[in-house]
């Protein structure tokens, strides 16, 4: 058995095996936003769909209120893109103008709450500079990697300016996880 | 096992358990692409490399025709990196002139075709306005999320201009699926 | 049992079985590059942090020297995103008075060493060309897919300029591996 | 500005049930962990139990855990320490915390006698 | 449960003296928490993860160990360092902490 040394008289198990279909695991996809208050120098948090569509939650992975909660301790992988999309006009111009376009810069943020410490840990940070030419813009912005996480932990999303964030399609827009 | 009370007794399986190595996985790489018909309003798809290279296809997973083949029903992680590359003027200059300049944008879907729905699902889209200054552009979009998929699903990556395709390298362009 | 059928008189073992806790996984995050001599035409290697923080290796997954190290065959999950950041002026300016602007691009590469074969093998590629409005940018370049690995096979990320790969947070830069 | 204010009665009957509510201004409780600790005349800090306000999921101290409900109100931004069966050894002054989403915030606790 | 123990139970020492307060947990811990208490007042925490400085507090309070073994210093006492210090462990459960150590002006 895998874990284990194969040997005709004896097995010496080095650790549980688990069936991975009943892996906790969720795949979240966008919603339209409400504006909620976030405190200052804190960015907002998203919230999703984890039913309808695409969207989904098992295995004692729920979501709840802007987080998904880790039922069980290990590794996972993480994963969120998040869409932008706004209007820009010439940025050298403005520049020159002394008037700093709005945005500057696009981020996201995947965040861990836990127990276990007292501030939110930031696991993952995209961000990038927007200063488009051309009137209309969009561009997404995607992380994934592997986190060791406890039971007990929430993940949640956070994004530079929530007016920005493409809400139109589950496909444009998502987060999820799932344990290794 | 994992997965279950732990008794001296008998045990009680709830799932189960699979070796890794026997799962359904691929990795297909980029080919250059043969002008193919398409339907108007619905994005070409590229093929691939199964092979050669880097590229491989395993158990049961199978490349045809631009589709992966989904053989078994589960939860698959699947992800795709495109890289675009294409020429440009200034875009302001000939956006003020009234010619919107080609690219207005460079978009990856990679969507499910499933004999249980009539059309095909979008179910990744990474899309971003492209109007760069300078005269040669180039840049990837990456997706990648978990989903599940039914045994017969078929997977393809759809673009919106397949001429503008980097098929020059491997390590460039590239999609892959497998199942967790 | 996983990968046997269920019968109640016997097993038919198709493939070892093995605990997903013990898989080889790192993720490594960014530390603060010191200049290295690196070969002509070739991109110079990152190094990384493997035990504070949010970086970890296990279950004989090592890193040393800019290398992770594979400690046994099979399919793997490999990841990176690096950020970078730079400062340029209006590059169309630059371009027509016949001095390109530094960066054109930037560019990640996720290269293999195997003593196997003479040459590295770039496995991913992430490139863009970079032509920012505006004085400073940054953007993050973000590539994963799975690779066939060998045991002794070695795994590093390579940048065309590592003095615009930002440094600062470990959850802007990283690199990871798992045994699928 | 973050505020915890632990608010119930300062007397309880043996017997009876310690009931302590805590109201938080300034922060989203959804976005941390509230715990409770508890402080005995002269001794140290006790950890009592907390409860995730997003989920209701709880842990107790196991020597308590037969004892003590924690449950929360988060229309109202509110937890809520419930200890059954009290004795003397049950006076304290009691904090509720708040931790994982801020950095550590206690109110300013409630002194509760247990006498007859 | 994972035992914090708590060395000295208290001090004397002088405005200026570097001053050092061990703990030792019965089993490894990944973070360690440092909490001051002045009487009548909620504690106030220091230190969190074992060597990180909580939003405002003076610099010269510092942590440092990992394991089984932490250390807590104040490199330069002041006057108004007088009060009891607390370490304490948030993984295992029940959250433990030390038995406190009183830290007085000679």
């Known amino acids: 058995l895998k874990g284990q040394e194969f040997a005709p008289s004896h097995q010496q198990v080095y650790a549980p095996l688990r069936a991975d279909g009943d892996k906790p695991r969720a795949h979240l996809t966008v919603v339209r936003q409400t504006p909620t208050q976030h405190f200052k120098n804190q960015f907002p948090a998203l919230h999703w769909e984890h039913e309808l569509g695409l969207a989904f939650t098992k295995n004692r992975m729920n979501y709840t209120n802007k987080f998904l909660l880790i039922p069980e301790s290990g590794d996972y992988f993480i994963y969120s893109q998040v869409t932008f999309r706004g209007m820009t006009s010439e940025c050298s111009e403005i520049r020159q103008a002394g008037r700093p376009n709005k945005p500057d810069s696009i981020t996201v943020v995947i965040t861990k709450v836990t127990d276990s410490y007292p501030e939110p840990t930031q696991l993952l940070m995209g961000t990038k500079s927007v200063c488009e030419v051309g009137s209309n813009w969009f561009q997404p912005i995607y992380l994934g990697a592997m986190f060791s996480l406890q039971e007990g932990d929430k993940l949640m999303v956070n994004v530079s300016d929530i007016s920005l964030v493409d809400y139109t399609k589950e496909d444009k827009t998502f987060f999820g996880a799932f344990l290794l | 096992l994992k997965g279950q009370e732990f008794a001296p007794s008998h045990q009680q399986v709830y799932a189960p358990l699979r070796a890794d190595g026997d799962k359904p996985r691929a990795h297909l790489t980029v080919v250059r692409q043969t002008p193919t018909q398409h339907f108007k309003n619905q994005f070409p798809a590229l093929h691939w490399e199964h092979e050669l290279g880097l590229a491989f296809t395993k158990n049961r997973m199978n490349y045809t025709n631009k589709f992966l083949l989904i053989p078994e029903s589960g939860d698959y992680f699947i992800y795709s990196q495109v890289t675009f590359r294409g020429m440009t003027s200034e875009c302001s200059e000939i956006r003020q002139a009234g010619r919107p300049n080609k690219p207005d944008s460079i978009t990856v879907v990679i969507t499910k075709v499933t004999d249980s729905y009539p059309e095909p699902t979008q179910l990744l889209m990474g899309t971003k306005s492209v109007c760069e200054v300078g005269s040669n552009w180039f840049q990837p979009i990456y997706l990648g999320a978990m989903f599940s998929l039914q045994e017969g699903d078929k997977l393809m990556v759809n673009v919106s201009d397949i001429s503008l395709v980097d098929y020059t390298k491997e390590d460039k362009t590239f999609f892959g699926a497998f199942l967790l | 049992l996983k990968g046997q059928e269920f019968a109640p008189s016997h097993q038919q073992v198709y493939a070892p079985l093995r605990a997903d806790g013990d898989k080889p996984r790192a993720h490594l995050t960014v530390v603060r590059q010191t200049p290295t001599q690196h070969f002509k035409n070739q991109f110079p290697a990152l190094h990384w942090e493997h035990e504070l923080g949010l970086a970890f290796t296990k279950n004989r997954m090592n890193y040393t020297n800019k290398f992770l190290l594979i400690p046994e065959s099979g399919d793997y999950f490999i990841y990176s995103q690096v950020t970078f950041r730079g400062m340029t002026s209006e590059c169309s300016e630059i371009r027509q008075a016949g001095r390109p602007n530094k960066p054109d691009s930037i560019t990640v590469v996720i290269t293999k060493v195997t003593d196997s074969y003479p040459e590295p093998t770039q496995l991913l590629m992430g490139t863009k060309s970079v032509c920012e409005v505006g004085s400073n940018w940054f953007q993050p370049i973000y590539l994963g897919a799975m690779f066939s690995l060998q045991e002794g096979d070695k795994l590093m990320v390579n940048v065309s300029d590592i003095s615009l790969v930002d440094y600062t947070k470990e959850d802007k830069t990283f690199f990871g591996a798992f045994l699928l | 500005q973050v505020q915890l204010q632990e608010s119930g009665p300062g007397l309880v009957r043996p017997s009876q049930t310690l009931s302590l509510t805590c109201t938080v201004s300034?922060?989203?409780?959804?976005?941390?962990?509230m715990h409770w600790v508890r402080q005995r005349p002269g001794r140290g800090l006790e950890w009592m139990g907390r409860i995730d306000p997003a989920s209701g999921h709880t842990k107790y101290n196991p020597s308590l855990k037969s004892r003590v409900t924690i449950t929360r109100d988060t229309s109202k931004n509110q937890v809520s320490l419930r200890l059954s069966s009290v004795t003397a050894a049950d006076t304290a002054v009691y904090y509720c915390v708040m931790s994982g989403g801020a950095p550590d915030v206690w109110g300013q606790g409630s002194l509760v006698t247990v006498s007859s | 449960d994972i035992q914090m123990t708590q060395s000295p139970s208290s001090l004397s020492a002088s405005v200026g003296d570097r001053v050092t307060i061990t703990c030792r947990a019965s089993q490894g811990v990944m973070y360690m928490y440092w909490y001051q208490q002045k009487p009548g007042k909620a504690p106030k925490l220091l230190i969190y993860?074992?060597?990180n400085l909580a939003s405002g507090v003076p610099s010269r309070f510092s942590g440092s160990g990992s394991g089984t073994d932490f250390t807590f210093t104040i490199s330069s006492l002041q006057p108004e360092d007088i009060a009891t210090y607390y370490c304490q462990q948030w993984e295992g459960n029940p959250r433990t902490f030390g038995q406190g150590t009183k830290v007085e002006i000679k």
């Open positions: 993860g074992a060597s």
């Open positions: 300034g922060f989203d409780i959804d976005d941390t962990y």
